[in-house]
């Protein structure tokens, strides 16, 4: 995790000012709205799940 | 400090029901999607439940064989996320664990509780 | 629903030597991008708890000794050089699609 203004997320993931964290990228396949996903710079998520 | 805290469990009788309870601390409760995750000698670890945040309009999912018989719900405003289990059989005793996962693998754990169907 | 194959289903591995666990889909669980695969420890006594997630993105206060690798339907985990507290069951757990599945689990044992 991080603070507001320190170094970057790791690769693959995201600062989230919602949960006040570093969020995988990953995880926007799941849950495409939140907010972190924004700052992930990676393909266009697949289809979801359900 | 993150934490997940069970109650709940116990000795049933087939047929009977129970309602198991996790209380969390630590995280921001009300964005994590929560699950029920249970384990036996027989069938490994099995999820059972999950119930999604409020921005997922609470959507529930079951496994095929709990579905109609347990039910999963969250109180944001107290932290805390239930199953109901209903019509329990012999086959639904093992440990039952509560846990969080913000989207796809599940991060923190409650302690489990022993749930037993036996007569 | 997806089957996850773990093998072996135990192992014994000398002190400082490579414990390789192995883990397959019976369908892929990858996007060009990530894999919806992770790995947990469990000890007896306690939950599972995470190691690797998304194959190969060790998780936050997991020793470097641990990797994960893999794509499509097989995957590995590597714990390199194991140590006496790497006695533990090891589980893949996939999160593809709905119902998540667990792999049976591989039961580590230091020689």
């Known amino acids: 995790e991080q603070a507001p203004g320190t170094a970057p997320c790791s690769r693959g993931s995201s600062w989230s000012a919602d949960l006040d964290a570093c969020m995988d990228c990953a995880s926007c396949r799941a849950r495409p709205h939140s907010d972190f996903c924004l700052g992930c710079a990676a393909a266009p998520p697949a289809p979801f799940r359900l | 400090q993150v934490q997940l805290q069970q109650s709940g469990g116990g000795l049933v009788q087939p047929g009977g029901s129970m309602k198991l309870s996790c209380i969390a601390s630590?995280?921001?409760?009300?964005?994590?999607?929560m699950s029920w995750v249970r384990q036996s000698p027989e069938k490994g670890l099995e999820w059972v439940a999950e119930?999604?945040?409020?921005?997922?309009?609470?959507?529930?999912h079951y496994a095929e064989s709990v579905k109609g018989k347990f039910t999963i719900s969250r109180d944001d405003s107290k932290s805390r996320f239930f199953l109901q289990m209903n019509n329990l059989r012999a086959e639904d005793t093992g440990i039952y664990y509560c846990?969080?996962?913000?989207?796809?693998?599940?991060?923190?754990w409650g302690q489990g509780t022993d749930l037993t169907v036996s007569s | 629903d997806i089957v996850m194959t773990q093998t072996p289903a135990s192992l014994a591995v000398s002190l400082g030597q490579r414990a390789t666990i192995s883990c397959r889909a019976s369908?892929?669980?990858?996007?060009?991008?990530?894999?919806?695969m992770h790995w947990y420890q469990q000890k007896p006594g306690q939950p599972p708890k995470l190691l690797i997630k998304?194959?190969?993105s060790l998780e936050s206060g997991v020793p470097a000794r641990f990797s994960g690798s893999g794509s499509g339907t097989d995957f590995t985990l590597n714990i390199h050089p194991v140590e006496e507290d790497d006695t533990a069951t090891y589980y893949c757990?996939?999160?593809?699609?709905?119902?998540?599945?667990f792999g049976g689990g591989t039961k580590l044992e230091i020689k």
């Open positions: 119930i999604r945040s409020k921005s997922d309009n609470y959507a529930t």
């Open positions: 630590g995280f921001t409760f009300s964005s994590y999607w």
């Open positions: 369908q892929s669980v990858s996007t060009s991008t990530y894999s919806y």
């Open positions: 998304y194959a190969s």
């Open positions: 846990s969080s996962t913000y989207a796809d693998y599940f991060h923190y």
């Open positions: 757990q996939h999160s593809w699609e709905i119902p998540y599945t």
